[in-house]
Each structure stands twice: as structure tokens, then as C-alpha cells.
């Protein structure tokens, strides 16, 4: 069986402050069963950026229609970017469980924030 791939095609993205940033992520298969989550940073101190099930993420929206069937695009858009948003963002696939188990992470996309043009 082919191993699941989590694909973040851009190594880096540069966005002007105040604009929106699109962070792309696709997976190669619908299975194993389990959710996708986005994080900033790696390791135990990483920050949860988007998880549809839990939390409130007013600045983050999925790029593709969340009701689309059998969709493998888990890209997100972050609005009103500020310098504090800079960092490396990871799209992470989890295997369903109690609790869910991290299965595979994308390679990461580094977000840099440019000063807003005057």
C-alpha cells in the first residue's frame, strides 16, 4: 500500500502586513481515518492554528468548501496578517483514536511578513 503523503508545496510564503496568507496542503489519500490540524512551530510547544472540531479561529478559514465530499485539500487562509504571525506552519494528519495519534506532518511552510507598503 502506498504511504499517505501530506504535501505542502511551498517552502515559504511572504505576505504584506494586513493582507491574507494562503497556506496550501493536500493529502494523497482519504485514509487512514482521522483529522487534519494546522500548527505553527514544531514540538511540544507548537501552537494550534486550525482544527475544525475544537476551538475558535476567527481569522482562519478553509480555502475549499468544508462541505465538499471526499476532498483532499486542507489549505487554509489566514486573514489580517501581522508580524506576530511569522513562523513555520505545519499541516498534520492524525489517525483517529482516543486520543488521536499524529501520523504524518507536511514539510512546513515558512510565513514571513513584510511591512505594509506606505
Amino acid at each position: 500500500e502506498e504511504e499517505l503523503q501530506v504535501i505542502q508545496p511551498e517552502k515559504s510564503v511572504s505576505v504584506a502586513a494586513g493582507d491574507s496568507a494562503t497556506l496550501n496542503c493536500t493529502v494523497s489519500s482519504l485514509i487512514p481515518v482521522g483529522p487534519i490540524q494546522w500548527f505553527r512551530g514544531a514540538g511540544p510547544g507548537r501552537e494550534l492554528i486550525y482544527n475544525l472540531k475544537e476551538g475558535h479561529f476567527p481569522r482562519v478559514t478553509p480555502v475549499s468548501d468544508p462541505t465538499k465530499r471526499n476532498n483532499m485539500d486542507f489549505s487554509i487562509r489566514i486573514s489580517n496578517i501581522t508580524p506576530a504571525d511569522a513562523g513555520t506552519y505545519y499541516c498534520v494528519k492524525f489517525r483517529k483514536g482516543s486520543p488521536d495519534v499524529e501520523l504524518k506532518s507536511g514539510a512546513g511552510t515558512e510565513l514571513s511578513v513584510r511591512a505594509k507598503p506606505s
Epitope: L4, I31, N71, D73
Partner: antibody, heavy 120, light 108 residues
């Protein structure tokens, strides 16, 4: 056209075993999770088990007794049922999972079911 | 485990009338709810998913609404082929996937 065809049902004594099969066609079988749902006579629907790609999930009522598996080369889903009890008597349906991105699974295609009767 | 309670258990409706079926979840399932129709001797058939989206090929007289813990399946004008048992199913928090106990829509 998606088709799911269950087989392997029948009458078995309490404590006995049975293996159900579900032959799938009309879609890329290996790309989707698959599920077994059962329905006792005159009763409602009860989820039994789901398999992704090696990841398996079971209802508490069958855990340790039933084993779900799949053979992607044969486009076939299986349910091995051991230590059968009278309360396992039901029509067993196999179903293809469909998912809404970011979310969970529901069942968009169902087979016609196979009847399992556990009786002495 | 999330418990789904369907009401009424039986709904007697005349052909051409509107039928309103309820499904209540014991906790918030957001929009992660599906509706199925089952006729005697047949397998269930998917009608609605994501609480409100009609499956391909399902007539427009079927509509789903609600979110959180309260959901409704409405059949705007009952046809003879709509007399059946209807089940809701949540897929927000599993295992286990859970189904409601069903609502039987019968001819008045």
C-alpha cells in the same frame, strides 16, 4: 455504478463463528474507509466496525469478538465474527464511507445486507 | 457516546402533506449529521449529509436543517414512495458512530 454485495450470512449456534464478505465494485475501493452496520429484526441501525487502511474501529458490543479486514487486491471487505451470541442476530450491511473534509464519515452506498441468525 | 433521539417515533401523514421529523443530539455535533431513508426489506439510502446537503439524485422535496443539537428533516409534499423509516446519524464524535432510533412515516 457503485455496488456492494454481502455474502456469508446464515444460521450459527451460540459460541460459533461466521465470516462475512462484501464484494465492492464501481469505485476505487482502496481509497475509501469501509464500514459494517447491523440491524436486528424490527430494530434500528447499529454501527459495528469501520476500517481505513489498517486502522480499525469497533463498537464496544463486538470488540474482542469481531475482526474487520479488507483485501484491496480483491476489492473485498470482511467481518470475522467469533463467539457469536443471540443478540448478534441481525442483517449485516456493508457500507462505503464518504467524508466531508475536516470532518467525519457517513455512508453513501450500502449493500443489500446478509442475515446472520444465532440460535441453538 | 452521543445519543440521538428522534421524534416522533411514528408520524401519520396524508399524501401531499408536509412531514417534519426531528433529531436531537445529546451534545453539540455542529453540522455533522446525516439522514437516511429505509424502506421495508431494503438497505438504507443516504438522503442528506452535513445537516442540509442533499445527496445527488434526492428530490428537492427533502430538506435538512439545524445545527448543534437540534436537527430537522422536512419532506415538503409526501409522495407514496416516501413512506418509510428515517434515521439520523452523527459523525462528529466517534467511535461509535450513532444512529437515532428512527421515525416511521406512515400513511394517514
Amino acid at each position: 455504478e457503485v455496488q456492494l454485495l454481502e455474502s456469508g450470512g446464515g444460521v450459527v449456534q451460540p459460541g460459533g463463528s461466521l465470516r462475512l464478505s462484501c464484494a465492492a465494485s464501481g469505485f476505487s475501493f482502496s481509497n475509501f474507509a469501509m464500514t459494517w452496520v447491523r440491524q436486528a429484526p424490527g430494530k434500528g441501525l447499529e454501527w459495528v466496525s469501520t476500517i481505513g487502511s489498517g486502522d480499525t474501529y469497533y463498537a464496544d458490543s463486538v470488540k474482542g469478538r469481531f475482526t474487520i479486514s479488507r483485501d484491496n487486491s480483491k476489492n473485498t471487505l470482511y467481518l470475522q465474527m467469533n463467539s457469536l451470541r443471540a443478540e448478534d442476530t441481525a442483517v449485516y450491511y456493508c457500507a462505503k464511507d464518504s467524508t466531508v473534509s475536516w470532518s467525519g464519515d457517513f455512508f453513501d452506498y450500502w449493500g443489500q445486507g446478509t442475515l446472520v441468525t444465532v440460535s441453538s | 457516546e452521543i445519543v440521538l433521539t428522534q421524534s416522533p417515533a411514528t408520524l401519520s401523514v396524508s399524501p401531499g402533506e408536509r412531514a417534519t421529523l426531528s433529531c436531537r443530539a445529546s451534545q453539540n455535533v455542529k453540522n455533522d449529521l446525516a439522514w437516511y431513508q429505509q424502506k421495508p426489506g431494503q438497505a438504507p439510502r443516504l438522503l442528506i449529509y452535513a445537516a442540509r446537503i442533499r445527496e445527488t439524485g434526492i428530490p428537492a422535496r427533502f430538506s435538512g436543517s439545524g445545527s448543534g443539537t437540534e436537527f430537522t428533516l422536512t419532506i415538503s409534499s409526501l409522495q407514496s414512495e416516501d413512506f418509510a423509516v428515517y434515521y439520523c446519524q452523527q459523525y462528529y464524535d466517534w467511535p461509535p458512530f450513532t444512529f437515532g432510533g428512527g421515525t416511521k412515516v406512515e400513511i394517514k
